[in-house]
């Protein structure tokens, strides 16, 4: 059962796993949620009745029954982890804590104009977990405006104390706001020879990389595959760090793979969700339960629904035994990973999908006017919406993309003549415009947010957000697309598609069926040559064939330029402008979404 509210002046008795320090009960709840075993917690707030050394302690707890006895205690705040909840979870914490000094290893000290600048510095520093900033009112003159970047083994402070005229806060890496490079490559036959901060067992290098990503100290990893010569090290995932933040030495070794933490791209690729099945593989760990199950998929479901289950091994039924049901072993460990991985015993293993809700929904794999385009199939572009105006009569106005359960990203120029959001309707999960009848359900628009600097599409800033009146329930036919990672600025996308119901030629009409066209990206230098009378800025991105023939056109505006990278679709562009449609040497010009990620997050995460 999901319990989100906090219990004031209440302490849970027993069940202690570990104690950390957090600046608030709210953040203690987040830490508990992300801990592999924590189900409940007790936080101690600052209070004259409490020993100051106990202030800000966050005791993480576990219980076989998923609850613990409650005791009244002033200044104690208790609650449950969000593991039991089905809603999306985020570790993003933008709060600034006034008059609190969060202790850790102070590894960098510099002058900063503001706490915000200090937080940005922390976010863009590979080692930084949190910071403390001495304001200009700080008593000690030489410490004023000093920004201390800090890290710890756990990612949380080692202690928190009251200190006047300082502010503290966390890195915003988990808010997708880091400019650090996102290196997704896994390097075969490579060992990174740097200090290990931890080691876990993993079935493959991808899981190892994801574990590295949500380990607070891991910057890169080395994984020894099951073919690794040294038997005791097979399936070993070594979590590593270095002072520079990069591997100091790369050693060529067969059957080893290495890679980097994905912390700078974690909002746009799955890092918690290990959804694969591992055949002929047994995961060892503490046994939670053994249940009969029809298949390994059913076993995974059972594990996902059991809040304490972290991973499982399924042994298929022998011939006609037990009505064809096999045994499903639900398991757990102290760190969420198997204690040992064995091969050749016929088991099928995997992980709970409960952690998938910690990943952005947009990373979920989907079922596999556009000039020169072809018709799409249902569910092919589940983030594509059709934006309608009802004034003076109802008609398709523009395309748009679902980027959150209450947010549509589109183009600013779509709102010419729109006097109020009341006249707008957003339809999702639509393939044919003819599906839209009077009684077809739609999302009303609560607010239109147009970029302050938008004047005309050709000058840039052609971007707008629609805040919906109600939330979108994600299904196979309506789900979000990932925003590109700021750390992905240098990625060369090769699989890009433009979609929409727009014209198929310059003088035409809105199409009934959603059209799609695969279109290559064009460099900004090349694009500038094609548009000499315009300024193609870095905030624009171009796509088109030199010979023309395929392009977006009138009515496609605001829709997505979607690019698939590492099996995840990213919203790389918003259809904006171009000379004519599909003309030779006149590429389409799109709003370059990566350059607006900060703006999007600022607007969508505003309190």
């Amino acid at each position: 059962e999901c319990v989100t509210q906090l219990l004031k002046d209440t302490c849970f008795e027993g069940g202690d796993i570990t104690t950390v320090f957090t600046p608030s009960a709210k953040y203690c709840q987040v830490v508990c949620t992300y801990h592999p075993r924590c189900l409940l917690f007790t936080f101690t707030a600052e209070s004259p009745s409490e020993d100051p050394t106990r202030w800000f302690t966050c005791v993480l707890k576990d219980s076989v029954t998923e609850t613990l006895p409650r005791v009244n205690r002033t200044a104690a705040i208790s609650g449950y982890s969000f593991k039991q909840c089905s809603h999306q979870i985020s570790a993003c914490n933008k709060d600034i804590y006034v008059d609190l000094d969060m202790k850790g290893i102070n590894y960098n000290s510099s002058v900063a104009k503001s706490a915000q600048e200090c937080q940005e510095r922390c976010t863009d520093d590979v080692h930084c977990h949190f910071f403390t900033y001495a304001t200009r009112q700080f008593p000690s003159l030489e410490h004023r405006n000093i920004c201390l970047l800090k890290h710890t083994q756990t990612g949380t402070p080692t202690r928190i104390t009251k200190l006047d005229k300082v502010v503290s806060g966390f890195s915003l890496k988990s808010c997708a706001l880091s400019n650090l490079a996102c290196i997704r490559d896994i390097f075969p036959n490579t060992v990174f020879a740097d200090s290990n901060i931890d080691s876990v067992m993993a079935p493959d290098a991808f899981v190892c990389g994801r574990i590295c990503t949500h380990h607070p100290g891991c910057l890169f990893f080395t994984f020894f595959s099951q073919e690794w010569p040294k038997e005791s090290q097979r399936n070993l995932c070594l979590l590593k760090t270095s002072e520079s933040g990069l591997p100091s030495t790369r050693i060529k070794k067969s059957k080893a793979l290495s890679g980097f933490s994905l912390q700078s791209c974690r909002h746009s690729i799955p890092v918690f969700c290990h959804s694969s099945f591992y055949h002929d593989t047994d995961f060892l760990g503490e046994e939670l339960d053994i249940v009969a199950a029809k298949s390994h998929e059913a076993c995974q479901k059972l594990c996902t629904n059991a809040v304490r289950c972290q991973f499982f091994t399924y042994t298929p039924a022998q011939a006609s035994c037990n009505e064809g049901k096999g045994k499903c072993y639900l398991k757990l460990s102290s760190n969420g990973s198997p204690t040992k991985i064995l091969h050749g015993r016929g088991g099928i293993s995997g992980y709970t999908l409960r952690l998938c809700k910690m990943d952005n929904e947009c990373t979920t794999k989907i079922k596999p006017r556009i000039v020169g385009g072809t018709a799409s199939v249902r569910g092919e572009w589940p983030w594509q919406v059709t934006l309608h105006t009802t004034s003076p009569t109802q008609r398709h106005l523009c395309g748009g993309s679902i980027i959150g359960n209450q947010w549509i990203l589109t183009a600013a120029h779509c709102f010419y003549g729109v006097e109020s959001p009341k006249i707008l309707r957003v339809y999702s999960g639509i393939l044919n415009q003819s599906e839209i009848k009077e009684d077809t359900s739609f999302f009303g628009v609560q607010e239109i947010i147009i970029h302050d600097q938008y004047k005309m599409a050709e000058s840039g800033y052609d971007i707008a957000l629609l805040k919906l009146e109600t939330t979108v329930n994600y299904t196979d036919s309506q789900r979000p697309i990932c925003l590109p990672s700021k750390g992905d600025r240098n990625v060369i996308y090769t699989d890009c598609w433009v979609t929409g119901w727009g014209y198929r030629k310059l003088r035409d009409k809105i199409q009934n069926t959603l059209q799609k066209a695969k279109i290559p990206l064009v460099t900004n230098e090349e694009c500038q040559k094609r548009y000499r009378g315009h300024k193609i800025t870095h905030k624009m991105i171009c796509a088109g064939y030199r010979e023309g023939g395929k392009d977006a056109c009138k009515g496609d505006s605001g829709g997505p330029l979607s690019c698939k990278h590492n099996e995840v679709w990213h919203l790389v562009g918003i259809t904006s402008w171009g000379e004519g449609c599909a003309q030779r040497e006149r590429p389409g010009v799109y709003t370059n979404v990566v350059e607006y990620v900060d703006w999007i997050l600022e607007k969508t995460q505003a309190v």
Partner: antibody, heavy 118, light 112 residues
Framework: QVQLKESGPGLVQPSQTLSLTCTVS????????LHWIRQPPGKGLEWMGL???????SYNSRLKSRLSITRDTSKSQVFLKMSGLQTEDTATYYC????????????WGQGTLVTVSS | DVVLTQTPGSLSVTLGDPASMSCRSS???????????LEWYLQKSGQSPQLLIY???NRFSGVPDRFAGSGSGTDFTLKISRVEPEDLGVYYC?????????FGSGTKLEIN
């Protein structure tokens, strides 16, 4: 509700500078674009310029050299200054607000008549 | 700058009859974003102008359906299917595709 009101001197000497104020209510100048438009007696409308909501300005190229549009967002006011006035600048001066984008003009002030005469 | 030429300068019609006026632009008003930023305004005697049509053919809310805008590129037309007494005044076309924006010279609609 949305209101725009132009104010300024009814009479200006030739060669002097005209200063007009458009005071708005019911919306913020940082959310909407504001235009100045004029109309000489018995003649047509002439678009003079606009204050974009981000603080940038655009001007009618014929008037650009003598025109300046500024604002004070805290007072919800946009100002028009035009130098070197001649008798042909005698007109009713309107301020107008766009919809979500710069145009179409959805709201207009009632206009203020400025006479250039010695 | 874009010059908008409106014809005729004045138009005398009988109430209940149709009326048609033209607005010709010195450059195409089709924007590269797919919109055509061409609008029609009516100014009645002693009043501020009021919006009738935006984007060539879209009637603003509350505008009677006897008003219809059409055209593309450089040639635009405003038609009134049956002129009513409240339709009298001066009609202006206006373009916001090219900066600086410009008004047409106006067409005065009078009663016969």
């Amino acid at each position: 509700q949305v209101q725009l009101k132009e104010s300024g001197p009814g009479l200006v000497q030739p060669s002097q500078t005209l200063s007009l104020t458009c005071t708005v209510s019911g919306f913020s100048l940082t959310s909407y674009h504001l235009h100045w438009i004029r109309q000489p007696p018995g003649k047509g409308l002439e678009w003079m310029g606009l204050m974009w909501r981000d603080g940038d300005t655009s001007y009618n190229s014929r008037l650009k050299s003598r025109l300046s549009i500024t604002r004070d967002t805290s007072k919800s006011q946009v100002f028009l200054k035009m130098s070197g006035l001649q008798t042909e600048d005698t007109a009713t001066y309107y301020c107008a607000r766009g919809m979500t984008l710069a145009t179409p003009f959805l709201y207009w002030g009632q206009g203020t008549l400025v006479t250039v005469s010695s | 700058d874009v010059v908008l030429t409106q014809t005729p300068g004045s138009l005398s019609v009988t109430l209940g009859d149709p009326a048609s006026m033209s607005c010709r632009s010195s450059q195409s008003l089709e924007s590269s974003d797919g919109n055509t930023y061409l609008e029609w305004y009516l100014q009645k005697s002693g009043q501020s102008p009021q919006l009738l049509i935006y984007g060539v053919s879209n009637r603003f809310s509350g505008v009677p359906d006897r008003f219809a805008g059409s055209g593309s590129g450089t040639d635009f037309t405003l038609k009134i299917s049956r002129v009513e007494p409240e339709d009298l005044g001066v009609y202006y076309c206006f373009q916001a595709t090219r900066d600086p924006f410009t008004f047409g010279s106006g067409t005065k609609l009078e009663i016969n």
